[in-house]
């Protein structure tokens, strides 16, 4: 007889789940030279035991403790990027200007991102059929707490100039309930950061209007200043410019707004 | 500006012991969690050990659990690491680091223990 399984609202553990993890792992190590003493077996020990056999809508962030250990590693604080809604484009940047870092560019982040995982009280089984929505089901749940545990340190170790790259095409562009207003936002370390400076970039070409003086920035702003952090705002009108200047500094159209 | 000083390290005996200090400025000392992180010869960063801003959490990698003590006086900004029992693979760059990691910019210049007969 069948067991019965818990059906969830969200989408099951991806795929081959414990292999991508483990690959990514070995991937990794393997592009950067100071993270080669990685034990990768170990690190998916501790990531399977942070969620393996406990119930999925009661994972705490000392679940993914020994996985944090694992995952120790050096990031200049002066050098760190934050997004929001807006990942493709950051992680192309930080690509290019390799000196920069997204939460994605360490080991950590690496290892979880566009994946979904979780398991089932009492039983050593992953979930593959469902898995909790943050909003329907509970919030929790084995990814929600990952991304805010490690959303949480990275902001937490940042320091100096802090930048964060946001999506001006959408209606909010700062969104309180994202997890760059919601978790990242309220963790920089005033003590630490000097400036928050984002940048807003725009989706329509022709798109001149200025986005610094949306409501939501403003609002971002006041968050911000009230953390006793300055704020300072610049649009990228052009992201392909802007990326294209990225690559070639020296490029006599790179003189001009961007 | 977060600046640390790292003191103590040197060279010793297995089975000894080390009194590893760091003295800390430019940043309210009791507000932050501190860490102690460490370097071997030709590895990576290894996260030893981890204290919260009041002292009354504190937390250790598994490979010194029982051998190593994390403490701190925050009327003097100063962070310790008390290592008994020392073996050959504690010898490292000892540093201490602002919050509990696993990202760490570590600011001093850390300091070098070494065990060995």
């Known amino acids: 007889v069948p067991r019965w399984r818990q059906q969830w609202s969200g989408p099951g553990t991806t795929k081959r789940f414990p292999e991508t993890v483990l690959a990514r792992c070995v991937k990794y190590t393997e592009i950067h030279p100071e993270m080669r003493h990685v034990d990768c077996q170990s690190v998916w020990d501790a990531f399977k035991g942070a969620f393996i056999s406990k119930h999925p809508c009661n994972i705490t962030e000392e679940d993914y403790q020994p996985l944090m250990k694992l995952g120790t590693q050096t990031v200049p604080c002066n050098k760190i990027l934050l997004w929001s809604r807006i990942k493709d484009l950051a992680h192309q940047f930080t690509q290019v200007q390799r000196d920069m870092f997204t939460l994605e560019d360490t080991l950590l982040g690496y290892l979880a991102d566009d994946l979904t995982w979780c398991g089932e009280f009492n039983t050593s089984k992953i979930n593959y059929q469902s898995c909790p929505d943050w909003r329907k089901d509970c919030s929790n749940n084995p990814v929600s707490v990952f991304w805010k545990t490690v959303s949480r340190r990275f902001a937490e170790a940042a320091c100096d100039v802090v930048h964060v790259m946001l999506n001006g095409s959408r209606s909010k562009i700062f969104d309180k309930n994202s997890t760059f207003g919601s978790v990242e936002v309220h963790n920089l370390q005033p003590e630490k950061v000097q400036t928050l400076e984002a940048w807003v970039i725009h989706g329509g070409r022709e798109d001149s209007r200025d986005l610094c003086q949306d409501p939501t920035i403003k609002e971002l702003e006041s968050i911000i200043s009230k953390r006793n952090i300055q704020f300072s705002c610049k649009n990228i009108y052009r992201p392909d410019k802007f990326l294209q200047c990225v690559k070639n500094p020296e490029d006599s159209s790179c003189t001009s707004e961007i | 500006e977060v600046q640390v000083l790292e003191s103590g390290g040197g060279l010793v005996q297995p089975g000894g012991s080390l009194r590893l200090s760091c003295a800390a400025s430019?940043?309210?000392?009791?507000?932050?969690?501190m860490s102690w992180v460490r370097q071997a010869p030709g590895k990576g960063l290894e996260w030893v050990s981890g204290?919260?801003?009041?002292?009354?959490?504190?937390d250790y990698a598994d490979s010194v659990k029982g051998r190593f003590t994390i403490s701190r006086d925050n009327s003097k900004n100063t962070l310790y690491l008390q290592m008994n029992s020392l073996r050959a693979e504690d010898t490292a760059v000892y540093y201490c680091?602002?919050?509990?990691?696993?990202?760490?910019?570590?600011r001093g210049q850390g300091t070098l223990v070494t065990v060995s007969s």
């Open positions: 430019g940043f309210t000392f009791s507000n932050f969690a």
């Open positions: 204290i919260s801003g009041s002292g009354g959490s504190t």
């Open positions: 680091a602002d919050g509990t990691g696993p990202f760490f910019d570590y």
